[in-house]
């Protein structure tokens, strides 16, 4: 399987909410001995391999934000801790999973990574990640709503998120 990032860049004004999205592609084994660990974290660009460094999102680690379930099942993070930090990660049965960040500030800008680990009991695990950038703008140059830019593999025309 692979992870796709529908959008590589999100440009948002301060105070707005944004949902960053990744999508699980390809055949997904739904056997009872396979589970999926999905999570989010921040990283830096100044490295050889994107997403190799794991930084917290609003002081929550990738362990705090993880989803753990089988196949294409739906799941949500533990509401309490994440929501106190204005965050919520979710996954649906179509392979989409996301993190929603509320009331953005400039401090939320940077590179975000989604990680999926396929865990086969008694076997090795397979891990893949996707990366996207969030730019939070202040002042008169800021858009009125979040604007999202498709990844290069898709149509390059930008789309305004509702």
């Amino acid at each position: 399987f692979k992870v796709a990032t529908p959008y590589s860049l999100y440009v948002c004004p301060e105070g707005q909410n944004v949902t960053l999205t990744c999508r699980l592609l390809g055949p997904v084994d739904k056997g009872h001995d396979v589970t999926f660990y999905k999570t989010w974290y921040r990283s830096s660009r100044g490295e050889v391999q994107t997403c190799s460094e794991r930084r917290p999102i609003r002081n929550l680690t990738f362990q705090d934000l993880h989803l753990h379930h089988g196949g294409h099942q739906a799941a949500n993070t533990s509401h309490d801790l994440a929501q106190r930090h204005g965050l919520e990660s979710a996954s649906d049965h179509h392979g989409n999973f996301s993190i929603t960040m509320r009331n953005l500030t400039l401090l939320d800008s940077g590179l975000y990574c989604c990680l999926v680990v396929e865990i086969r009991h008694h076997h090795s695990e397979h891990r893949v990640h996707g990366a996207m950038e969030l730019q939070v703008q202040t002042g008169k140059d800021a858009p009125s709503n979040c604007v999202v830019y498709p990844s290069s593999s898709q149509d390059s025309e930008n789309i305004t998120a509702a």
């Epitope: 860049l9 440009v11 660009r45 100044g46 930084r55 917290p56 609003r58 401090l107 800008s109 940077g110």
Partner: antibody
Framework: AVQLQESGPGLVRPSQSLSLTCTVT?????????WNWIRQFPGSKLEWLGF???????NYNPSLESRISITRHTSKNQFFLHLNSMTTEDTATYYC??????????????WGAGTTVTVSS | DIVLTQSPASLAVSLGQRATISCRGS??????????MQWYQQKPGQPPKLLIY???NVESGVPARFSGSGSGTDFSLNIHPVEEDDIAMYFC?????????FGGGTKLEIK
Amino acid sequence: AVQLQESGPGLVRPSQSLSLTCTVTDYSITSDYAWNWIRQFPGSKLEWLGFIGYSGNTNYNPSLESRISITRHTSKNQFFLHLNSMTTEDTATYYCARSLYGGSHWYFDVWGAGTTVTVSS
Amino acid sequence: DIVLTQSPASLAVSLGQRATISCRGSESVEYYGTILMQWYQQKPGQPPKLLIYGASNVESGVPARFSGSGSGTDFSLNIHPVEEDDIAMYFCQQSRKVPWTFGGGTKLEIK
């Protein structure tokens, strides 16, 4: 190690525009970080003017937003400060500085030596 | 804007003694548990130099006699023991909200 160096006119006439250049060596301004302009008035007060991020996005001090622009020339690894409608109140030492971008902490870890700009007729 | 008020404006300390500089913000500089407060040292004719970030993290290469503490709106920089080389201006700076702002500075002198 990364180095930053400011250049530009030392004297500007009132109502004219100021253009300063910051040349960065030993680090690509498109790789990471935010690239800032900060000024220090006579008497030592420091004021952050704005930054251009590694991907070209800008954020400015709201008090200057109507007359400031920060741009860059990626192949020359330079970024620029443009400040129009200069008055004597803009007399200061102007610094360019690098700051972390998109991490838990945002701070100025590398500074240029500064260039003094006097606004006078 | 977040206003940072430094005190005292100037400070004279004997060599080997402790210097304490305070910085108070007009509002909190914390963001979900991260403290966005820095301290810089500036010597005459030089640019400011980062000493402390995140209120208490000492920048690489900065002597251990420099330490920072505080949370919310109240912060302090401690220098102990003070050395001749520490004669300089010291500034606090917040990056919690745009515009990022600096304190007015504290001038450290030797008695």
